[in-house]
C-alpha cells in the first residue's frame, strides 16, 4: 500500500488518483506522434520534438521546463561517399558490395533523412585483407581462437556476429586482437525467432535490415572530448586524438543477406563447435581467408563517416515539492533515435510523457509532491548516454547532495512476455510492493497482480516465490548517476520470454523497421503491457517523491552483499594453492559484510519505531537511507575506469550491459593464471578486496546511529 | 612437398618406456597442429591427441589422458609420442598426421610406426 | 562426444557401379566431416572435407554430400584401385574429433 502523506488529496487516494488517470489511449497518440520522422541526435528533427516537448510538458502543469544545451562529439556517416565493404579479386576489382541503405518499409519510402546502417564513431578508413570470423567477438571467443586454436586475427578483418554483449566490447577485443577493422551483422540465430515472419508482417528481421549503433568504450565519461565536465561554452575540448573511448579500426554493420556472401566463402579452420554456428547456409569456418577457389579474393572496409562536435538537448522538467524541494527524484529517458525509434525510445517516451501529463492533472487540482521530482527527456543516449552525463557533471554538486532516486524510462517493452527490472537493492521491497497493487495485464493472469504473474513467469533463482530483479550493469542513461554518482537507479520494462526465445535484444532493434506499425500490430495493439509500464515506473517515482519515509529498505542490500561475497570467495577459490602462497584472504570482506548486516537491522528497528511527527529526526533518518547508496562510491574509481565509483556494482568489463558485482575484485582475478607476474596480481587482489572492506564497512557506519 | 617421417617400428616390453617420433618437412612447422592416432592390428582409426609445435600447447582425447605424453621440439621440426610404462595393449600402429586447419581434418600423414609390446 | 556410425561395415559393388557409403552423427556438426580411404599397409587419405570439398588430386567420381547429421560419400563410376577402406571423421568439437568405424569397399 502507498505510505504517501496527503497534501491536498487524502491519503489513500493520492496513489490510486496519479495511477487512474494514466491511459493506454495516450501512451498510443504519444508514441504515434514521436515516431513520424527520425529524430538522430543533432538534427534539426530532434531539436523541433524537444522544443515541442518543452511546450507540452508546460501544458501539462510541470512547474518549470528548461533545454539544456551541450556540444558533445557525434558521428555521421558522409552524405555524398557511402559506407560499404566488397569482396576484392586478385586485380583489385569489386566483384560484390554490400548494401548501402536498409530497403525502407511500406509507407515510409519518401521520408527523407533516414540514417544509412553505420557504427557511430568508426574512424574512417580502407582496411583490405583476409576475413576471420569471431563468433560474438566476446572474450572467450577470442581467447578460444587465439590462445586455444593457435589463429591469429592480427591483421586481419574480423567479421562478428551482434549479440551477447555490448558491440564496443566486441570493437575493444577485437583492436587488442590486433585486427585491422571489424564487420558487425545479425545473425538470424540471434535476430529471427523461429515461426515468426519478418517485418512487415512480423517482428523479425529481414535479411536487408541492419542494427546501427555506437562502438565507443567510454566507461562512463559522457562526451570524449569533455570527460569529468559539461560540453557547455566555455569547456575546454581533447584533441581527437585524446578522446576517450574512440575505437582504431574501422568497424561497419551489415545485414543477414550481405553476410551470407561473405561467410559462404570462408575457409581455413572450421569453427571449434557448434556454439559457434549460426542459422545461416554457410559452414561457419574460422578463416583465415576464403577457401580453395576463392583464395585469390580480398575483403576490403570503405568507410568515410565524419565525428564532429554538434549541438544536443535535454528537457529538463521540474515538479516542485511540497515539504522537501531540495530532495530530488528523477525520471528520465532519451528522446534521440536512430530512424523511427518505435520501440527505442520513444515507447518510454510515450509512457514518461503520460506520467508527466497524469502529475501534472493533479498539479492542477492543488497536489504536490513531498519531494521534487525532476523529469528528464535526454539526447544523443545513442551516441554514448552523452545527454544525460553532460547533464549530471553540470549538476553534480547538487545532484550528490540532493538526488534521492532515478528511474530510467527508455523502452517500455523488449517483448511482451513478462516485467523485467533491474534496481538498487533498495528499490527491492518498493518494488514488490508496488507491483502486487498493480494488476497483471497478461493473458492468463486477470484479475491477478503483476507481481504473481511476474514471479510465475521470471522465478527469482533464490528466493521461491519472488520474481527476478537484476543488477543494473550500463548501457543506458540511469549510468551516471548510478555509476558515478551513487544515486539510488532502477529500471523496468516488459520483456521476451528468455527461456524460448534466445535472439539477443529484439529483432529489429535499431534498424529503420522499428515503427510505430511493429509496435501497435505486433508487441502490444491495445496499449497494455506499456500502460503497466507506466504504472511501474510512475507508481515508483510516486512513493520515491511522496512517501513520508523513504521506500528503500537497506536490510535487502546486506542480503545482496552477502551473496555477492561468497561469489567473488568461490571465484578466488579457484586458486586455493595462490591464496595461500600470497596469504589472500576474505575474512575482512565477510567481516564488513556481518557488520553491515546487523548494523542494517538495527537501523530498520529504529526506522520503523521513530517518531515520524518530528521533522528533524524524519529528514535525518531519510538522509541516512538517501545517501546509503552514495556512501558505496569510491572517490578514487575503479582502476583505469575513474568514472565507474560504485564498489558493489559496475558494468562488466567485457560487456557493458551486464553489471558485475564486486568488480574491483572480480577484474583483478579475471585471467589472474595468465599473468607474468603472479605476486604483482595477487597483491592487486588484497589491494581490491581491503578496498571493498573498507566501503562496506565505511556504508555501514553511515546506518549507525548518529551519536 | 610437406612430408612427415616417422620413426621406424619398435619391439618392446611390457613396463618398458618409449619415444617415437615425427618429422616434418616441406612447411611451416610451428604453423600448424600435429595429431597422433592409434590403430589397433584390424581396428580402425582413434584420435589421441594434438600438439601445437609453435608453443607446445597440447590436448589429450579422454582415452589416452595420461596414458601417453606428446611433445615438440620445434627446433628440429619433430613431435614425439611417448609412453613410460607400456602395456601389451598398446600393441598397434600409430600415425602421425597434420591438422589442415586448427580445427579440420588431417591433410597429411605419416607412414606410421608399429609398435609392438611383447613379452 | 559425437558419436559417428558408418553404414554398410562392408560394400560389396562392381567396377564402373555407383558405390554409396554412409556416415551418421550423433548431434549436429554443420559441414564439419572428412572422408579418407585407407588401403592394406598404407596411412589413411584425405579425400573430402567440409563434407564435400575434394582435396587437390582427387578424382572427381568421389564426392560428398550431407549437413548436420546425414553425411554421404559416393563414387560414381568405380574402379578396382578404389578398393579400400572408407573412414568418416567430425572436426566439429574442437580439439575433439572422432572416426567412424569404417566401411570396407570390395570391388566384385
Known amino acids: 500500500k502507498s505510505s504517501s502523506e496527503a497534501t491536498n488529496i487524502t491519503p489513500k487516494h493520492n496513489m490510486k488518483a496519479f495511477l487512474d488517470e494514466l491511459k493506454a489511449e495516450n501512451i498510443k497518440k504519444f508514441l504515434h506522434n514521436f515516431t513520424q520522422i527520425p529524430h538522430l541526435a543533432g538534427t534539426e528533427q530532434n531539436f523541433q520534438l524537444a522544443k515541442q516537448i518543452q511546450s507540452q510538458w508546460k501544458e501539462f502543469g510541470l512547474d518549470s521546463v528548461e533545454l539544456t544545451h551541450y556540444d558533445v562529439l557525434l558521428s555521421y556517416p558522409n552524405k555524398t561517399h557511402p559506407n560499404y565493404i566488397s569482396i576484392i579479386n586478385e586485380d583489385g576489382n569489386e566483384i560484390f558490395n554490400t548494401s548501402l541503405f536498409e530497403p525502407p518499409p511500406a509507407g515510409y519510402e519518401n521520408v527523407s533523412d533516414i540514417v544509412p546502417p553505420f557504427s557511430a564513431f568508426s574512424p574512417q578508413g580502407m582496411p583490405e585483407g583476409d576475413l576471420v570470423y569471431v563468433n560474438y567477438a566476446r572474450t572467450e571467443d577470442f581467447f578460444k581462437l587465439e590462445r586455444d586454436m593457435k589463429i591469429n586475427c592480427s591483421g586481419k578483418i574480423v567479421i562478428a556476429r551482434y549479440g551477447k554483449v555490448f558491440r564496443g566490447n566486441k570493437v575493444k577485443n577485437a583492436q587488442l586482437a590486433g585486427a585491422t577493422g571489424v564487420i558487425l551483422y545479425s545473425d538470424p540465430a540471434d535476430y529471427f525467432a523461429p515461426g515468426v515472419k519478418s517485418y512487415p508482417d512480423g517482428w523479425n528481421l529481414p535479411g536487408g535490415g541492419v542494427q546501427r549503433g555506437n562502438i565507443l568504450n567510454l566507461n562512463g565519461a559522457g562526451d570524449p572530448l569533455t570527460p569529468g565536465y559539461p560540453a557547455n561554452e566555455y569547456a575546454y575540448r581533447r584533441g581527437m586524438a585524446e578522446a576517450v573511448g574512440l575505437p582504431s579500426i574501422p568497424v561497419h554493420p551489415i545485414g543477414y543477406y550481405d553476410a551470407q556472401k561473405l561467410l559462404e566463402k570462408m575457409g581455413g579452420s572450421a569453427s571449434p563447435d557448434s556454439s559457434w554456428r549460426g542459422s545461416l547456409k554457410v559452414p561457419y569456418n574460422v578463416g583465415p581467408g576464403f577457401t580453395g577457389n576463392f583464395s585469390t579474393q580480398k575483403v576490403k572496409m570503405h568507410i568515410h563517416s565524419t565525428s564532429e562536435v554538434t549541438r544536443i538537448y535535454n528537457v529538463i522538467g521540474t515538479l516542485r515539492g511540497a515539504v522537501e524541494p531540495d530532495r530530488y527524484v528523477i525520471l528520465g529517458g532519451h528522446r534521440d533515435s536512430w530512424v523511427f525509434g518505435g520501440i527505442d525510445p520513444q515507447s518510454g517516451a510515450a509512457v514518461v510523457h503520460e506520467i508527466v501529463r497524469s502529475f501534472g492533472t493533479l498539479k492542477k487540482e492543488g497536489w504536490r509532491p513531498r519531494r521534487t521530482i525532476l523529469f528528464a527527456s535526454w539526447d544523443a543516449e545513442e551516441f554514448g548516454l552523452l545527454g544525460s552525463t553532460e547533464w549530471a557533471e553540470e549538476n553534480s554538486r547538487l545532484l550528490q547532495e540532493r538526488g534521492v532516486a532515478y528511474i530510467n524510462a527508455d523502452s517500455s517493452i523488449e517483448g511482451n512476455y513478462t516485467l523485467r527490472v533491474d534496481c538498487t537493492p533498495l528499490m527491492y521491497s518498493l518494488v514488490y510492493n508496488l507491483t502486487k497493487e498493480l494488476e497483471s495485464p497478461d493473458e492468463g493472469f486477470e484479475g491477478k497482480s503483476l507481481y504473481e504473474s511476474w514471479t510465475k513467469k521470471s522465478p527469482s533463482p533464490e528466493f521461491s516465490g519472488m520474481p527476478r530483479i537484476s543488477k543494473l550493469g550500463s548501457g543506458n542513461d540511469f549510468e551516471v548517476f548510478f555509476q558515478r554518482l551513487g544515486i539510488a537507479s532502477g529500471r523496468a520494462r516488459y520483456t521476451k520470454n528468455w527461456e524460448t526465445n534466445k535472439f539477443s535484444s529484439y529483432p529489429l532493434y535499431h534498424s529503420v523497421y522499428e515503427t510505430y506499425e511493429l509496435v501497435e500490430k505486433f508487441y502490444d495493439p491495445m496499449f497494455k503491457y506499456h500502460l503497466t509500464v507506466a504504472q511501474v515506473r510512475g507508481g515508483m517515482v510516486f512513493e520515491l517523491a511522496n512517501s513520508v519515509v523513504l521506500p528503500f529498505d537497506c536490510r535487502d542490500y546486506a542480503v545482496v552483499l552477502r551473496k555477492y561475497a561468497d561469489k567473488i570467495y568461490n571465484i578466488s577459490m579457484k586458486h586455493p594453492q595462490e591464496m595461500k602462497t600470497y596469504s589472500v584472504s576474505f575474512d575482512s570482506l565477510f567481516s564488513a559484510v556481518k557488520n553491515f548486516t546487523e548494523i542494517a537491522s538495527k537501523f530498520s528497528e529504529r526506522l520503523r519505531d521513530f517518531d515520524k511527527s518530528n521533522p528533524i529526526l524524519l529528514r535525518m533518518m531519510n538522509d541516512q537511507l538517501m545517501f546509503l547508496e552514495r556512501a558505496f562510491i569510491d572517490p578514487l574509481g575503479l582502476p583505469d575506469r575513474p568514472f565507474y565509483r560504485h564498489v558493489i556494482y559496475a558494468p562488466s568489463s567485457h560487456n557493458k550491459y551486464a553489471g558485475e558485482s564486486f568488480p574491483g575484485i572480480y577484474d583483478a582475478l579475471f585471467d589472474i593464471e595468465s599473468k607474468v607476474d603472479p605476486s604483482q596480481a595477487w597483491g592487486e587482489v588484497k589491494r581490491q578486496i581491503s578496498v571493498a572492506t573498507f566501503t562496506v564497512q565505511a556504508a555501514a557506519e553511515t546506518l549507525s546511529e548518529v551519536a | 612437398e610437406v612430408q612427415l617421417v616417422q620413426s621406424g617400428a619398435e619391439v618392446k616390453k611390457p613396463g618398458e618406456s618409449l619415444k617415437i617420433s615425427c618429422k616434418g618437412s616441406?612447411?611451416?612447422?610451428?604453423?600448424?597442429?600435429i595429431g597422433w592416432v592409434r590403430q589397433m592390428p584390424g581396428k580402425g582409426l582413434e584420435w589421441m591427441g594434438i600438439i601445437y609445435p609453435g608453443d607446445s600447447d597440447t590436448r589429450y582425447s579422454p582415452s589416452f589422458q595420461g596414458q601417453v605424453t606428446i611433445s615438440a621440439d620445434k627446433s628440429i621440426s619433430t613431435a614425439y609420442l611417448q609412453w613410460s610404462s607400456l602395456k601389451a595393449s598398446d600393441t598397434a600402429m600409430y600415425y602421425c598426421?597434420?591438422?589442415?586447419?586448427?580445427?579440420?581434418?588431417?591433410?597429411?600423414w605419416g607412414q606410421g610406426t608399429l609398435v609392438t609390446v611383447s613379452s | 562426444g559425437i558419436v559417428m556410425t558408418q553404414s554398410p561395415a562392408t560394400l560389396s559393388v562392381s567396377p564402373g557401379e555407383r558405390a554409396t557409403l554412409s556416415c551418421r552423427t550423433s548431434?549436429?556438426?554443420?559441414?564439419?566431416l572428412a572422408w579418407y580411404q585407407q588401403k592394406p599397409g598404407q596411412a589413411p587419405r584425405l579425400l573430402i572435407y567440409g563434407a564435400s570439398s575434394r582435396t587437390t588430386g582427387i578424382p572427381a567420381r568421389f564426392s560428398g554430400s550431407g549437413s548436420g547429421t546425414e553425411f554421404t560419400l559416393t563414387i560414381s563410376s568405380l574402379q578396382s584401385e578404389d578398393s579400400a577402406v572408407y573412414y568418416c571423421?567430425?572436426?566439429?568439437?574442437?580439439?575433439?574429433?572422432?572416426f567412424g568405424q569404417g566401411t570396407e569397399l570390395e570391388i566384385k
Open positions: 598426421a597434420r591438422r589442415m586447419a586448427a580445427a579440420g581434418p588431417f591433410d597429411y
Open positions: 548431434q549436429s556438426i554443420g559441414w564439419n
Open positions: 616441406g612447411y611451416s612447422f610451428t604453423s600448424y597442429w
Open positions: 571423421q567430425h572436426y566439429d568439437n574442437w580439439p575433439m574429433c572422432s
